[in-house]
Structure formats: C-alpha cells, structure tokens
C-alpha cells in the first residue's frame, strides 16, 4: 500500500487552530515533476457533505512530502469530508477523513467501519441532543432510509446493512429531519472486495494474518498497519509518537500523538494513534489495553507488563505477543519482512533460527505460497544460531505472495511469514527517440515507456550499422539523460535499440524494438571566395566565385548565395543547385540598396564556411522609358532612330543607351551610348545590308531606366558586309562613339 497518512488535529477549542496534514513516506512524493509523479493534493470534498461557503482554506507545502490545510474560521468549516491524494500512476491513492461536529444532534459511535464482503455492517448514531422527529439516513448524499424517532435503542439509531458488497462503500449520514445537516452523524463504510482473510482477483489468496489491528488489502494482500505499527504483518511496534510504514514520521508537538486522528489508505480508514482513544483521541488507554483506539488487549503472561503503545513487554526468557513463548522454544531470527527478486532468477534465501535444543538443517523448512515445501541445501551452524540456505527453483509470477520459514524442534516450533515480490524486468514498448543528428554522431533520448516493473537502474543503448552482421556496440547511460553516440560513419543508417534493467540479479529486460537513425552527410569544409561581381541593372547583379583546389571529389551539392540588406534587416538567399557552377545572376534586387554578399558550399542540409563578405551598392532605379521610338532605314548600312524624351523625369538625363540586335540572331545584343542627352535622334551606321534589326533604348540618370518599346527595321539591299553598327548623333556627325 502507498505510505500516505492524513492527520487531523482534533483540539477543537478553537477552529482556527484546527489543521489537517497529509504526509507521504513515498520516495519523492509531492515534488510534482515527471520523475516523481503528481504532487500531494489535500482538499475539502463538498460533493456529499455540503457546507455553507466560507473564506478559502490555505494550503501550505512543507517540503516535498507534506501538505497542510489551515484557515478554518468557524466550527461548521470543519464538518464534512476531506481527502488527500498521493502516489503516482497505478499507485495513486486517496485517503479520506470524515469530520463530525462535536455539538451535533447525532454523533457516530464509530466513524470508520471496515467490513468484509458479505458481512453485516451496523452503523450506530448516538443521540447527543434529542429531537422528536424522524431520522433520515443517507448514502453518498442520496436518501437511503428513515427511522421513526421512537426506534432509538439505548439512545442510539442503528442502520443495519446485511450482506454488504463493495458498491455499498461510501459516506453515510444520520440526520434529524428537522435539524441542520451540519448536525448529522457522518460515517465512512469501507467494504473490502473479499470475504474475511482473503484477497486477490478471485479472492483465492489467503491474507498474511495482520496483527495489532492491521487490515489485509483485498487487492495486493499487504497489511495496512495501524499508526504506530510496522512490518509485513504489523508485528512490530514503533517507538512512542512515531508512525508511517517504517515508523519514519514523528507526531508534532510535545504531547506526541494525543489529539490526532490518523487516516490511512483503504481498507484501514481512520483511528486514533497507538495508545489513544475517544472521539477526540485525547484519552489514554485504560490499563490492559493498547494500540490504535486502544482496541487491543494485552493479556500478558509469565510476568509480562502491558505498554499502551506496544503491547506486552516480556521479561527475560520469554517472547511472543503475550509473552507466551519460552526462549527455549525455537525462534526464527531477523527474517526480512519483504524480499524482492526478478522473474526467472534462482535466488538463495537464508533463514536463521535459535533455540534449545539447537535447530539443525533438517528442522528448518521454507514453504512457498502454493504450499510447496523446500528443504535447505546447506546450513551454517554458529554458537547462537543455525542459518539454513535454500536454493529456490526458477521464479515465476505465481511465486509472488507470502512465504513462510518454519522451524521445528522437540522444544516446539516457530514460523515467520515474509512477502516475496517477483518483479518483471522492464521491456521498452517503444524505440528510442532521435533528438539531433550530425555526420558522425546521433543524440538520442533513451528512456521510453516500458512494460514490467521499475525502478529503472540502468539503460543500455545497443547500436550498429543497418544490415550489418557485426557485433552490436553498447553504451550504458544514465536513465534521465540524453545520449550522444559518437564516432559514427557519415550518411549511414544505424539500428538502435534500448535495453532496460531494474535492480537485482536477473533484472535485465529484453531488448526493445529497433529504430533506424541515419547520420547526416559530411560537412562541406571548403571555403569559397568571391572573384567579382558587376551590376547588370538597377535590380540585377552577376556574381562569380572560386573554390580552392583540393585532391579527391568535391564534397558538396551546390552553393548558397546570401545578400544581407542591413537597412531593412532582410536576407535574400539564392540556391545554386550545381556544385560545378561558378557564376550566378541575381535578379529582383532592390535598386539603390547596399548589400553584404557572401557564398558558401552546402552538402545535404549542412552549410560549409562562408566566403569573406563583399559589399555591393546597387544603383538607384533610373528614369522612365523614352517614348515613341521609331526606326527608319536610310541606306543599306544605316538606320535612323527617333524618339521623344521620357516624361516626369526625376533629374537631368546623363545619356541614352541603344540596344541593337539582329532579329532572330543568337548572339548577344550590342549596347551603344548616346552621350548627348538633349538629342531625340541618332543614326546607327555600319549595319549589314538586307538585314532585319531590333532596337530599343533607355535613359540613364544615376542609374539605368526602363527599356522603351522594341522597334524593327531592315537595312536596304545590295550593300557590302559592314564591320558593325556605329552611331551618329544629328548634331555631331564627326567623333563617332563606337
């Protein structure tokens, strides 16, 4: 069972001093991180017992395993159901405390009733302030039964519940019809899922025989021990003022556990601490009584004395619950109350005994839950004890349960039950997860969901190249950390599997499912440099670069050109997808912009070192296009162009540029400057006869402007082959600028 205790401080003279504390003895409880599961929750449950709203209660966390509820302002705040939830996953457990008003009309004789399936439960509400009206019983907030006020017996109203079943569990209340619900008697009924002394899915397993008022859990067969007792069967008393499954907690305050109600996981419920009784747990046990609620009787023999916290204290020479066993009777010594082994292991179990006559090897036997008796294979005889060693056959899951070591001599016999937990080694349900990859390493998250039992003590990562028959490489890692697999081959698929282990011999689980993880390409190492660049327009830039010469094949898939516009904070990226390319035309740039330019080699998704940057200033955008361009053949080698100046000029034109191209020709066009911007006509000379030409032109101010429309014209026929076109401006027939 989960080690969870809900403490209620019942010193009720002042509600503001009332508090509830939930204490968890579970490892890491309440921290709320993924590693430890959800935090402790402590709250008032208003679903069944509704009380008028008041100021919100204050929740304070004291360290990782304790939470306290305070801030009760009036007695009615206290009435009702409180719950604490703790433990993680399948072990998440709710502990419930039911608080009754001490001034209620009806009071429960006993708040918590734990009964077995099929039993008759009897809830008894004692009349504290009589009213001559009906008594209404409710179950979990719904009407259940009515009693006439004359039906009280010895000042008590009884509700008999025959043949109870687990669904009958819950909160019951008895209320005078003409009284406030806060004056009700509230009860908690816990119905175990099995008949007396049985547990398990079909109630086929036998309970260990819980001592000192411990209650056998119907799911796992463990004893839920009363506060102040410990051990598999609650056989051992804690020191006064201590509680928790290992007696690790201490009652607060100078008066120890006086005035405290302890609530434990079902099917225990609530009680006073060991040595105390009464509705407010403030009365010490009467002589001869001990334990939680003083429910146990000492009945000490052979001069034993009764201690109200631990029971009989035996004089020298005697032992046993009632000091009924002579020290001459054999006695099992220091047997662990719980042992844990892994499935399919063959453990050795030791059992030591003393007595007079002295126990020998054959007088000590080990009994499994299925009744099989094992005899010891060897015994170590020492002056004060004999230790028998048992070699256990390969363990199966059915071996989980209560084992018994028994010693028999002519002086008598003794036996000690202990719990064996057979744990299933963990097996990953999923493959490990790839976090990041490089050319020679993979970063992997190894911890995955698993079947079987924790805790995980070690994680092994096995890996090898895909389709390889070579041995697996193995790395042992910390369960909570990511793993880097190093010194791998680039661009290679690796099969990766996880193996989990839990503590103890044979704790290694089977390997989990494989997953394929592929390393990245090798990083490109060559650094290009920019050879040059030139502006081919206000928004066009031609860039060229080189790479150093190295032996062997080029590691790279292409180039990435980057242009950084610092003014606007924008980056332009151009992908050149051939590793052989050494030049690129960048278009659609912003005229008049200062760019920082660099180039780098890429391979797969990896980028090599960038070239040293270059700084490029694109000219601003130029003027609009010249208008109404017209071509007229003058001879077999001359064509005259006329045009009109562009409209809405942003400044004075510095020149015009004419583009001449043979129609249908494959060669590059020729650009001719007209350096007299005031002209609106020019003659292009040196053309071939009977040849069709295409012409267009643009103006330049600080930068080149837009192209005009294209015009076509043919030279006249029968001319000689010219050397090439030249241009003549109307006002300047000499000094041709070719």
């Amino acid at each position: 069972a989960v080690d969870l205790t809900l403490l209620a401080n019942l010193r009720l003279t002042d509600p503001q001093r009332f508090f509830l504390t939930c204490v968890s003895g579970e490892a890491g409880a309440g921290r709320g991180s993924d590693a430890w599961g959800p935090p402790l929750l402590l709250e008032k449950d208003d679903r069944i017992v509704r009380t008028p709203p008041g100021p919100p209660l204050r929740l304070a966390r004291n360290g990782s395993h304790q939470v306290t509820l305070r801030g009760f302002s009036k007695p009615s705040d206290l009435v009702g159901v409180f719950s604490c939830v703790g433990g993680a996953g399948a072990r998440r457990t709710r502990v419930i405390y039911v608080h009754n008003s001490p001034g209620a009309h009806l009071l429960p004789d006993k708040v918590t009733h734990t009964v077995n399936k099929g039993d008759t439960a009897v809830l008894s509400a004692r009349v504290h302030k009589e009213k001559q009206t009906d008594v209404i019983w409710k179950s979990n907030g719904s009407y259940f039964y009515t009693l006439d006020w004359h039906e009280a017996q010895d000042g008590r109203f009884l509700l008999q519940l025959p043949n109870v079943q687990p669904p009958s569990s819950g909160i019951y209340s008895a209320t005078y019809l003409e009284a406030s619900p806060l004056g009700s008697a509230f009860f908690r009924l816990i119905v175990r899922g099995c008949g007396a002394g049985r547990w398990g899915p079909g109630c086929t397993k036998e309970c260990p025989g819980c001592l000192h008022g411990g209650v056998c859990h119907d799911h796992d067969g463990e004893c839920v021990c009363p506060p102040g007792f410990t051990g598999t069967r609650c056989e051992q008393a804690c020191r006064e003022g201590r509680f928790g499954q290992s007696c690790q907690e201490q009652c607060p305050g100078i008066s120890g556990c006086r005035g405290l109600t302890f609530c434990l996981p079902d099917p225990y419920g609530c009680s006073c601490g060991s040595g105390w009784r009464g509705s407010q747990c403030q009365e010490a046990c009467a002589p001869g009584h001990f334990g939680a609620d003083c429910r146990l009787q000492c009945q000490c023999q052979n001069g034993g004395t009764c201690d109200r916290f631990s029971g009989c204290v035996c004089p020298s020479g005697w032992h046993g619950v009632h000091c009924e066993k002579s020290d001459r009777i054999p006695q099992i010594l220091n047997m662990a109350s719980e042992l844990e082994f892994n499935l399919e292991t063959m453990p050795r179990i030791n059992c030591a005994a003393a007595g007079n006559p002295f126990p020998v090897r054959g007088s000590i036997e080990l009994r499994k839950p299925d009744g099989t008796v094992l005899l010891s294979t060897k015994a170590i005889v020492e002056p004060e004890k004999t230790t028998a060693e048992f070699e256990v056959p390969r363990l199966v899951l059915a071996d989980s349960g209560f084992w018994e070591c028994r010693v028999s001599t002519s002086g008598g016999q003794d036996s000690r039950r202990f719990k064996v937990n057979v744990k299933v080694p963990p097996v990953p349900l999923a493959a490990p997860r790839l976090l990041t990859k490089q050319s020679r390493q993979l970063v992997v998250s190894p911890l995955v969901s698993f079947s079987g039992d924790g805790p995980i003590s070690t994680v092994r990562l096995h890996y090898r190249p895909q389709d390889s028959t070579m041995d697996w490489s193995t790395i042992v890692v910390d369960p909570s950390e990511n793993v880097t697999l190093m010194n791998l081959r680039p661009k290679t698929g690796y099969s990766v599997r996880v193996q989990l282990s839990r503590p103890g011999e044979g704790g290694e689980g089977a390997w989990g499912p494989p997953t394929l993880m592929t390393t990245d390409c090798p990083e490109p190492l060559l650094q290009p440099w920019l050879e040059g660049w030139h502006v081919e327009g206000t928004d066009r830039l031609r860039v060229s670069w080189s790479l150093p010469l190295v032996p062997g094949p080029l590691v790279g898939d292409g180039f990435l050109l980057r242009l950084w516009d610092g003014t606007r904070g924008q980056e332009r990226r151009e992908n050149v997808s051939s590793p052989q390319a050494r030049t690129a035309l960048l278009t659609g740039l912003t005229p008049g912009t200062h760019y920082q330019l660099d180039v780098q080699l890429y391979h797969c998704t990896l980028l090599g070192p960038a070239s040293p940057p270059a700084h490029v200033l694109l000219p601003p955008s130029g003027p609009p296009a010249p208008r109404h361009l017209h071509a007229q053949a003058l001879s077999d080698s001359e064509i005259q162009l006329t045009w009109k100046h562009p409209e809405a000029l942003p400044g004075p034109i510095s020149k015009y540029v004419v583009e001449v191209q043979v129609a249908g020709g494959a060669g590059d066009p020729l650009w001719i400057d007209v350096d007299r911007p005031e002209e609106t006509s020019t003659i292009i000379r040196g053309l071939n006869a009977s040849t069709r030409y295409l012409f267009r032109m643009r103006a330049s101010i600080q930068g080149l402007g837009d192209w005009s429309n294209t015009v076509e014209e043919s030279t006249l026929g029968n001319g000689l082959q010219a050397e090439g076109p030249v241009q003549e401006s109307r006002a300047a027939e000499e000094g041709l600028d070719q």
Epitope: Y143, T146, T175, L177, E178, P181
Partner: antibody, heavy 127, light 102 residues
C-alpha cells in the same frame, strides 16, 4: 420506472371492513416511508396514515385512529390499509404515496415530499 | 396542529397570463417543509415544489415557489393550457403532513 398500484376499493356498508393494497415496483420499497392519503368526492386531500420502512412504526390521523391499521410486506413490495368500522365520511378515493427526502436549497434541513402517487382506489361507504 | 389556508379559492385566467397562488400557515413553518402539488380531474396529485422553492424532477421552469414563515407563494409565470388544475400546498411538522384546501 416507479409505479404504485392500489386495489381493494369498493362499496361497503357502514360498520363494515375493507382491505386496500398498494403494489410497488421500480424502487427499493423497503427503504421508504409510505403513506395513505384520501380525497372525498369534490374535496381536498387528507393524510390518513404513515408507515416507516421497518414496518414497526406507524402514524394515523385522529379521524381514523383505532379503526384503520397500516402495514407493509417488504418481501412482497406491498403496502396495506385495513379499514374497520367504516363510516359514510370515509367515502373517498384512497391514494398510496411514497415519501422522498430532498436536500433543500441553501444549507437548511432536509425537505420531504410525496414524489410518487398511485392512481387511487375508490371506497364507498353507504347503506 | 398547523392549519393551512389557500387563496384565492378560484383563480380565473387565460393562457399566457401569470398566476400567483397564496398559501398561509396558522403558525410559522420551516421553508424546508412546504411543498406544492398539482391535481388534474381524475388524476393523482403530482409533486411540483419541495422546500418552498425547489422544483421537483421534470417540472418546467415556469413554476416557481417562494416565501417563508407563514406566507408562501406558487407562481406560474406564463400559463399553458395544461396548467389549469387544482393546486395544494402541504406542510410537514411533527411527523405529520397537512394539506391546504386547494
């Protein structure tokens, strides 16, 4: 579905006897207080008698005390009303009804109400 | 014993109108112990309101109850044709149920 079905009514002479039955179904009969309520022709409702779940405790209106006996058989889910020394003023439709108890609004006491009624059976006392 | 009186004895209204029915106790009654019932000719009564103001299961929200002490009211906000019936108030006290005259 909760159902209450009365039977046993009829014509009886003054001083005579009659036994009414009420068969219950659709709920755990043994948990509830049951009542007989009557309604004289053209008149209002009048509570006659109550019986507690155990059957051991009963209540009667002054007008019928000593003449009528309410009882129940929880194993048969049946409520009874034994009427003796009948008078003309006992002429009425007799209804059996179940008492339920509700959480009243706010945080006050529990609120009772007759949440299910039978269809009624007519008792006529006449010479 | 506590006596219950209801007024008016008869209320003549049309569908769509608002009906206000009054119930008075001869001495103070806890609001938890006042209920209202509806009865149509030839039918058994039906629980409408318990605890003076809480609607029973399946009762439309045009029915509402209010009041405390000795004066209680049943209001039907907008009458439907099926609402024309006899209405009884009832109090509980000392383990006894007492009905108004309707």
């Amino acid at each position: 579905e909760v159902q209450l079905l009365e039977s046993g009514g009829g014509l009886v002479q003054p001083g005579g006897s009659l036994r009414l039955s009420c068969a219950a179904s659709g709920f755990t009969f043994s948990m509830y207080v049951m009542k007989w309520v009557r309604q004289a022709p053209g008149k209002g409702l009048e509570w006659v008698s109550s019986i507690y779940p155990s059957g051991g405790y009963t209540r009667y209106a002054d007008s019928v005390k000593g003449r009528f006996t309410i009882s129940r058989d929880n194993s048969k889910n049946t409520l009874y009303l034994q009427m003796n020394s009948l008078r003309a003023e006992d002429t009425a439709v007799y209804y059996c009804a179940r008492v339920n108890y509700y959480d009243s609004s706010g945080y006050g006491p529990i609120a009772p109400g007759l949440d299910y009624w039978g269809q009624g059976t007519l008792v006529t006392v006449s010479s | 014993d506590i006596q219950m009186t209801q007024s008016p004895g008869t209320l003549s209204l049309s569908p769509g109108e608002r009906a206000t029915l009054s119930c008075r106790a001869s001495q103070s009654v806890s609001s938890s112990y006042l209920a209202w019932y509806q009865q149509k000719p030839g039918q058994a009564p039906r629980l409408l309101i318990y605890g003076a103001s809480s609607r029973a299961t399946g009762i439309p929200d045009r029915f509402s109850g209010s009041g405390s002490g000795t004066d209680f009211t049943l209001t039907i906000s907008r009458l439907e044709p099926e609402d024309f019936a006899v209405y009884y108030c009832q109090q509980y006290g000392s383990s006894l149920f007492t009905f108004g005259p309707g």
